[in-house]
């Protein structure tokens, strides 16, 4: 907590951001909270991006003020209007582009003071993998597929029974460029699979880590997958 006096003679207010990642082509959120004011008229929110001349977004006197907005963000930004009064200055960014990556500043003015915090925003592509038994193969084979990744990730297989085993010799991974020529489809095949075992296909780049699990028994197949964004830290 920083308590001081700015040029205006008002106190500093606490502003908190969380580093996050955007999935290109989808909507993203740049997270920012601040000490709330009791009235909306004095709240000003400005989002700025390092290296960009115009504003990313401005909200003042209870409404969006977009006359100074940079062209690259035109029609793509919005604050959560009903949440501003309770200290939420987070920005929704529509149709995330690769070029949206960078350092953003969330700058806040209220009747109680001013404050700002920076946010590192990474962009890329990440998706949930699905692991299936490949019945077309000659031996027991698992196929792990994830439709959209960027930058190119690493793929590692693991098994519950053979913990610590290296499956690189018995797996084959390929990356197929998608139609928009940025993201890639990830396909990894694991050979010589034994039943009554749980296998995990782990896909990771510097933005996200995703895991697809499959449990193969004689009577059933169980699947589970989850995705985790990396480097989400508050400042």
């Amino acid at each position: 907590l920083i308590i001081g006096f700015g040029i205006s003679g008002r106190h500093s207010i606490t502003v908190t951001t969380v580093a996050s990642a955007g999935n290109i082509g989808e909507d993203g959120i740049l997270s920012c909270t601040f000490e709330p004011d009791i009235k909306l008229s004095d709240i000003v929110i400005q989002w700025l991006k390092e290296g960009v001349l115009g504003l990313v977004h401005e909200f003042k006197e209870g409404k969006d003020e977009l006359s100074e907005q940079d062209e690259m963000f035109r029609g793509r930004t919005a604050v959560f209007a009903d949440q501003v009064i309770v200290g939420n200055a987070s920005l929704r960014l529509k149709n995330v582009q690769l070029t949206d990556a960078g350092t953003y500043k969330c700058y806040i003015i209220t009747s109680k003071g001013k404050g700002n915090a920076n946010l590192e925003y990474k962009t890329g592509a990440f998706s949930m993998p699905e692991v299936n038994v490949d019945y077309n193969a000659s031996s027991e084979t698992l196929r792990c597929e994830a439709p959209r990744w960027f930058p190119q990730p690493t793929v590692v297989w693991a098994s519950q029974v053979d913990q610590g085993a290296n499956f690189s010799e018995v797996s084959n991974t390929s990356f197929e460029l998608n139609s928009e020529n940025v993201t890639m489809k990830v396909v990894s095949v694991l050979y010589n699979v034994t039943i009554n075992n749980t296998y995990s296909c782990m896909i990771e780049n510097d933005i996200a880590k995703a895991t697809g699990d499959i449990k193969v028994t004689e009577s059933e197949i169980k699947r589970r997958s989850h995705l985790q964004l990396l480097n989400s830290k508050a400042s």
């Epitope: 709330p36 004011d37 009235k39 008229s41 009064i85 109680k112």
Partner: antibody
Framework: QVQLQQPGSVLVRPGTSVKLSCKAS????????MNWVKQRPGQGLEWIGG????????EYNEKFKGKATLTVDTSSSTAFMDLNRLTSEDSAVYYC????????WGQGTLVTVSA | DIMLTQSHKFMSTSVGDRVSITCKAS??????VAWYQQKPGQSPKLLIS???YRYTGVPDRFTGSGSGTDFTFTISSVQAEDLAVYYC?????????FGAGTKLELK
């Protein structure tokens, strides 16, 4: 879930003071404004003022300056309102309400000023 | 101070009716208007914030609209449990102010 607990009623003598309490639970007490609202029997709602517990910052309705004093005890997540020099005009239900949207309300304390 | 005028002190309605309550601000308050419902002997309950945002758990028959100085609160199909007093409130500037209330009653 959010709860704001207020005593049901209090009877006070004219010319005296009263301290009303509002005990909060179910959210981070220090990070939301706490507002106080007056409602006379059969009447509408009047905002008295608000306090931001994290700093103790207060905002008052000019009409209630000198009449009401807002304080908090962050250790017990409790907001207080002192009303002084009470008259029959102060007989009303007093509500505490959380955040600038008045998202959650206490049940209210009925203050009766009577000799 | 910003004054909020609710033109009808009482409104008569029937179950299943669509009803709209208006609120006029004495100056521009952007979209900083909330609507509350108060039933007899109970504390007010937030229904709509920032003019049009339904609060968590509020049924979708309740809607709000407007910006600037003119605001409307609508119940698309009145239920018996909706009979109450409805208040508008502005949080654009201090002092925060409420409308005088509109009592919704059965015809």
């Amino acid at each position: 879930q959010v709860q704001l607990q207020q005593p049901g009623s209090v009877l006070v003598r004219p010319g005296t003071s009263v301290k009303l309490s509002c005990k909060a639970s179910g959210y981070t007490f220090t990070s939301s404004w706490m507002n106080w609202v007056k409602q006379r029997p059969g009447q509408g709602l009047e905002w008295i003022g608000g306090i931001y517990p994290n700093r103790g910052t207060t905002e008052y309705n000019e009409k209630f300056k000198g009449k009401a004093t807002l304080t908090v005890d962050t250790s017990s997540s409790t907001a207080f309102m002192d009303l002084n020099r009470l008259t029959s005009e102060d007989s009303a239900v007093y509500y505490c309400a959380r955040d600038s949207r008045f998202a959650d309300w206490g049940q209210g304390t009925l203050v009766t000023v009577s000799a | 101070d910003i004054m909020l005028t609710q033109s009808h002190k009482f409104m008569s309605t029937s179950v299943g009716d669509r009803v709209s309550i208006t609120c006029k601000a004495s100056q521009d308050v952007s979209a900083a208007v909330a609507w509350y419902q108060q039933k007899p002997g109970q504390s007010p309950k937030l229904l709509i914030s920032s003019a049009s945002y339904r609060y968590t758990g509020v049924p979708d028959r309740f809607t709000g609209s407007g910006s600037g100085t003119d605001f409307t609160f609508t119940i698309s199909s009145v239920q018996a449990e909706d009979l109450a007093v409805y208040y508008c409130q502005q949080h654009y500037n201090t002092p925060l102010t409420f409308g005088a209330g509109t009592k919704l009653e059965l015809k």
